[in-house]
Amino acid sequence: MAPWPELGDAQPNPDKYLEGAAGQQPTAPDKSKETNKTDNTEAPVTKIELLPSYSTATLIDEPTEVDDPWNLPTLQDSGIKWSERDTKGKILCFFQGIGRLILLLGFLYFFVCSLDILSSAFQLVGGKMAGQFFSNSSIMSNPLLGLVIGVLVTVLVQSSSTSTSIVVSMVSSSLLTVRAAIPIIMGANIGTSITNTIVALMQVGDRSEFRRAFAGATVHDFFNWLSVLVLLPVEVATHYLEIITQLIVESFHFKNGEDAPDLLKVITKPFTKLIVQLDKKVISQIAMNDEKAKNKSLVKIWCKTFTNKTQINVTVPSTANCTSPSLCWTDGIQNWTMKNVTYKENIAKCQHIFVNFHLPDLAVGTILLILSLLVLCGCLIMIVKILGSVLKGQVATVIKKTINTDFPFPFAWLTGYLAILVGAGMTFIVQSSSVFTSALTPLIGIGVITIERAYPLTLGSNIGTTTTAILAALASPGNALRSSLQIALCHFFFNISGILLWYPIPFTRLPIRMAKGLGNISAKYRWFAVFYLIIFFFLIPLTVFGLSLAGWRVLVGVGVPVVFIIILVLCLRLLQSRCPRVLPKKLQNWNFLPLWMRSLKPWDAVVSKFTGCFQMRCCCCCRVCCRACCLLCDCPKCCRCSKCCEDLEEAQEGQDVPVKAPETFDNITISREAQGEVPASDSKTECTAL
């Protein structure tokens, strides 16, 4: 398939050069119903013949299909065809391809490492606080409190496995019942989805990329929130997760298994352990009310220690305090007993940057948080850049077709389930749902994967992380085996229940619609993405936590009116869109409310004013800073060096005329030439992998 239209082609070729043709630009499947059509039988689209790339005729009067911002962009190849290259050019192109692949893998490696360090940073900053959340006695009686603690702790430590392991140790020490642990596990499931949402924020520079990336990331959030919304009340009423998992645990005579294989960690650990090493036990000890642990540092200093178990004589107030009568005596004055003590002798220090600094955990955490976010952002930008240059023409077509195309009729419905399995498998390999979904996010952003396809992959990722937990549970010591396995199974069945709720019937795939809605809002008002993150992962959980501490009467007193208002708004919204005639004229739209209650425009003005002071200081900043700047304020001309905001603003201004926005150009170089940014002569120097 020729990536460029042949100039000599007088006849229109519907297969090759038509916008919307199956081979060229797959359309997003219909949101409301599962498509059974194969690649060749897509919904009919308005066919516009694509004129040669130097023509601007196609910039005007776009067909309605292309106006859909969720359609994947076509990244056409702007390079010279392989057949047209001389030997030197072919060799050069081959090595360029190899170089790109090495760079891509390198940046991907540091991307995953930065996620690991980001988790460590969060644990250093909020780990002890997270541990203290667990020591709250109200968790036992209040499932809502358990849920928000699960969210907050997982957000604070950036690792659901850490919060889950704390819960497991608390259950096996009888500090927590399985019943009380289930809402915490549900919360941990929500909390873990913040990571890829943070990763999506890094793609804020390009509106359409950000729209897709943010929606792709938040589809995970919405799935988790909606699952909890339905399944937590069901669990509280029926205890079905507790009962099912208890039956499973009791029906099998499990033997201690092997540890879950650390596949990705094997590669990343050598690097991350040079940056920082943490003593994760400290958080668990704080959760278990160990007073001594509160003064311990999370930063691991000694990596090699010798533990010597010995018996020592210790005095006790009376013989009643003796470990056993046979190990008790008196010297005539004091009572003595034998106590088993473990002497820990430090042998070798750890080899990481912070080992000799003796900085407080908060300082180390803050440093690592900033650095890891910068590396994460930098790697993400580079991954997107490299992928953008590699995924063009036939490569893009093959990849996009492979990932986003359904099986032929009548097996189209199976595609999603295969994607769930792929997601689970990949997550099992990388041992982290955060890593998998975070790696998925830029691919959604640049348009390689549709949100419709990313959704089952994400659901699979949720399953994958629980299978890892089940394996880890099977490797637990005898006393913790039952509780850890039951909790891991609760996690597993919770996700299975969620999938059954929000996946099999296309109509119930609410998370996709909600994520797209949020994506659209966030693409228009980019500050809303940060607002969403703060509200959903911090403010709401903290508010519920605070109200729960005040007592159930306060919680109900505040919660019931809030829930009532939300239900009322949703019902009204549903009636407005489905059957507005049943409503009084005034209630048929939201115009009866003041503008600030029904639109983000006035809020946008407030945020823009508030962040106005940053705009002047933002000048001549690096691309990373520019992205952060664009996120806070839609600053139009602030980043002249990187031009990212400026380019976007020009594109926005141009949207009054029915001209293609840059993201809908079939060829990136056309859009640049049309806007006078890239000299036409440069457009042919690109080299593609094929």
């Epitope: 013989t319 056993s324 008790c328 008196t330 010297d331 005539g332 004055i333 004091q334 009572n335 003595w336």
Partner: antibody, heavy 119, light 107 residues
Framework: QVQLVESGAEVKQPGESVKVSCKTS????????VHWVRQAPGQGLEWMGA????????SYAQKFQGRVTLTVDKSTSTAYMELSSLRSEDTAVYYC????????????WGQGTLVTVSS | DIQMTQSPSFLSASVGDRVTITCSAS??????VAWYQQKPGQSPKELIY???NRFTGVPSRFSGSGSGTDFTLTISSLQPEDFATYYC?????????FGQGTKVEIK
């Protein structure tokens, strides 16, 4: 070698007090407790109390509580036992003994001091 | 207080005999028991501590056993210098208490 040397025999009248000394040598005085045991003529051994020279802590048998006082002089490595309000039944040989290290057994004993209470 | 009861109170034996003295505690004392030997006109000497550990310089013919409430001192082959009174003592909990003693005489 470890030695505990007690003061000489005493003859006392009922109601009086007696103070028996026990000079130790051959070990670190403050490390081991000093016990006092008495033996009435033709009778068995009876523990009176003990003192820790290092801390000054004392412990007395209920029977002698309030009548016996145990003290030490670290400078001379000497332990003292004072028994007040003497009665005829207090006639006995009074032994000082070194306690085993952190034990209630007695590994080295003094030669004993005979205290006779008679009117 | 813990009572220590020794039996027998008197024991007649010949040189070379195997002699066993028993001591019974009124409650569990673990292994916190010591045995002493006292010859007439002399102060007591420690033989055994921790129910079975021989004190420095004590001949190997002396051995101790038992735990909980029942303890035994065994002289495997009685020697002329072994004719004396033997006391058991508990140091499980204060106050320290002794048995009433067992006098070993020449038959």
């Amino acid at each position: 070698q470890v030695q505990l040397v007690e003061s000489g025999a005493e003859v006392k009248q009922p109601g009086e007090s007696v103070k028996v000394s026990c000079k130790t040598s051959g070990y670190t005085f403050t490390t081991y407790n000093v016990h006092w045991v008495r033996q009435a003529p033709g009778q068995g051994l009876e523990w009176m109390g003990a003192i820790s020279p290092g801390s000054g802590l004392t412990s007395y048998a209920q029977k002698f509580q309030g009548r016996v006082t145990l003290t030490v002089d670290k400078s001379t490595s000497t332990a003292y036992m004072e028994l007040s309000s003497l009665r005829s039944e207090d006639t006995a040989v009074y032994y000082c003994a070194r306690g085993g290290f952190r034990l209630g057994s007695m590994d080295y004993w003094g030669q004993g001091t005979l205290v006779t209470v008679s009117s | 207080d813990i009572q220590m009861t020794q039996s027998p109170s008197f024991l007649s034996a010949s040189v070379g005999d195997r002699v066993t003295i028993t001591c019974s505690a009124s409650q569990n004392v673990g292994t916190s028991v010591a045995w002493y030997q006292q010859k007439p006109g002399q102060s007591p000497k420690e033989l055994i501590y921790w129910a079975s550990n021989r004190f420095t310089g004590v001949p190997s013919r002396f051995s101790g056993s038992g735990s909980g409430t029942d303890f035994t001192l065994t002289i495997s082959s009685l020697q002329p210098e072994d004719f004396a009174t033997y006391y058991c003592q508990q140091y499980s909990s204060p106050p320290l208490t002794f048995g009433q003693g067992t006098k070993v005489e020449i038959k």
